[in-house]
């Protein structure tokens, strides 16, 4: 008799999830020699231990603490780039601007980027059929709790000037419900962080509006100011040119506004 299995609203665990996590860990420690002390098998065991045999709507930050400990990594606290709804450009930027880091440039972020996972209560099985959706099922699911945990720690580590890349093409340029808006903003430490600088990325070629005046940006400024952190904002009118100028800052066309 087939055992009854909980049907969740979200997609199931990414196929070959264990192999992917292990392979990513091995690759990361190869290309980042300062992390070569990490034992990737132990990392996978800790990752697995966070959600296997646990109800996928009852995951806590505590479940991820062994993994957090193994993945402890020091990144320059004044070189942190946060992002919201514009991951690809943020990653393209840090691939060129090597001394800046997004969460996905750290070991733990790199391991989990674009993956989904969950288990089942009281069985050692990984659920490849479905996993809880944050909205339709529950917020305390393995994926959401993981990102909340690592995002909080990443924001807490930041200092001096912290940059955030925001998508100017969205109706809510700053969204209070995003990971940035709900977790990272509230975990920047005012005693360490002097300024949050927002880069609003324009989508349209002919879009010359000052999106720093957008009501949601003003809302972000208000939240940040109340936390005793200064706020500044820049429009990035031409993201393609922006990346090109990061690659070749000496280019004569890079002195004009981007």
């Amino acid at each position: 008799v087939p055992r009854w299995r909980q049907q969740w609203s979200g997609p199931g665990t990414t196929k070959r999830f264990p192999e992917t996590v292990l392979a990513r860990c091995v690759k990361y420690t190869e290309i980042h020699p300062e992390m070569r002390h990490v034992d990737c098998q132990s990392v996978w065991d800790a990752f697995k231990g966070a959600f296997i045999s646990k109800h996928p709507c009852n995951i806590t930050e505590e479940d991820y603490q062994p993994l957090m400990k193994l993945g402890t990594q020091t990144v320059p606290c004044n070189k942190i780039l946060l992002w919201s709804r514009i991951k690809d450009l943020a990653h393209q930027f840090t691939q060129v601007q090597r001394d800046m880091f997004t969460l996905e440039d750290t070991l733990l972020g790199y391991l989990a980027d674009d993956l989904t996972w969950c288990g089942e209560f009281n069985t050692s099985k990984i659920n490849y059929q479905s996993c809880p959706d944050w909205r339709k099922d529950c917020s305390n699911n393995p994926v959401s709790v993981f990102w909340k945990t690592v995002s909080r720690r990443f924001a807490e580590a930041a200092c001096d000037v912290v940059h955030v890349m925001l998508n100017g093409s969205r109706s809510k340029i700053f969204d209070k419900n995003s990971t940035f808006g709900s977790v990272e903003v509230h975990n920047l430490q005012p005693e360490k962080v002097q300024t949050l600088e927002a880069w609003v990325i324009h989508g349209g070629r002919e879009d010359s509006r000052d999106l720093c005046q957008d009501p949601t940006i003003k809302e972000l400024e208000s939240i940040i100011s109340k936390r005793n952190i200064q706020f500044s904002c820049k429009n990035i009118y031409r993201p393609d040119k922006f990346l090109q100028c990061v690659k070749n800052p000496e280019d004569s066309s890079c002195t004009s506004e981007i």
Epitope: P33, V96, R98
Partner: antibody
Framework: SLEESGGGLVKPGASLTLTCKAS?????????MCWVRQAPGKGLEWISC???????TYYANWAKGRFTISRTSSTTVTLQMTSLTAADTATYFC?????????WGPGTLVTVSS | DIVMTQTPSSVEAAVGGTVTIKCQAS??????LAWYQQKPGQPPKVLIY???TLASGVPSRFKGSGSGTHFTLTISDLESADAATYYC???????????????FGGGTEVVVK
Amino acid sequence: SLEESGGGLVKPGASLTLTCKASGFSFSSGCDMCWVRQAPGKGLEWISCIYTGSGSTYYANWAKGRFTISRTSSTTVTLQMTSLTAADTATYFCAGDSDYLGLWGPGTLVTVSS
Amino acid sequence: DIVMTQTPSSVEAAVGGTVTIKCQASQNIGNYLAWYQQKPGQPPKVLIYRASTLASGVPSRFKGSGSGTHFTLTISDLESADAATYYCQSYYYTTDDNYRSWAFGGGTEVVVK
């Protein structure tokens, strides 16, 4: 420590295999083992590295095709060189560690001359 | 491949003086930069790694700084034993196509008077 061997005098067009032997440690855990050369009176030139943890190999653009790096045992890395010319005359160093090269052998001289 | 441009190619300074050597990378390499000292007939010896970390047993007279594309090695309180050729070396990677490379600067000969 590291020690290179296999250098010597060869004719243009010949092939040669250099060997790097580690003593006091093995490559079983992941480290980068590299080959670097230095022509007489000139600077250092990176040729190739192998990451012993995965066996992944990396080459300078100019070295691709003519040079092959391999790990032949838990303590030995080789560099095969083909179609040698006078421009390949140099001291060849084996070096290891990671993003920086903390451990070097004394070098082996390769002379390409007819 | 990344190109490392090292300046000057030669520098002369008196005992007790200070020497500054600069190294520029053709692409941003973060802090993945090392400095080596090489004396005639010997292999290079690492002095500084990850731009500013002093290697074991290296005196604190050697100081590395910089990040991204511009790096500096400063040798203060120069001693006659510091006469050597100094090289910078970069390490670069890309995650997408699994590419890694190392590159050396052209070297700087330090002459101590």
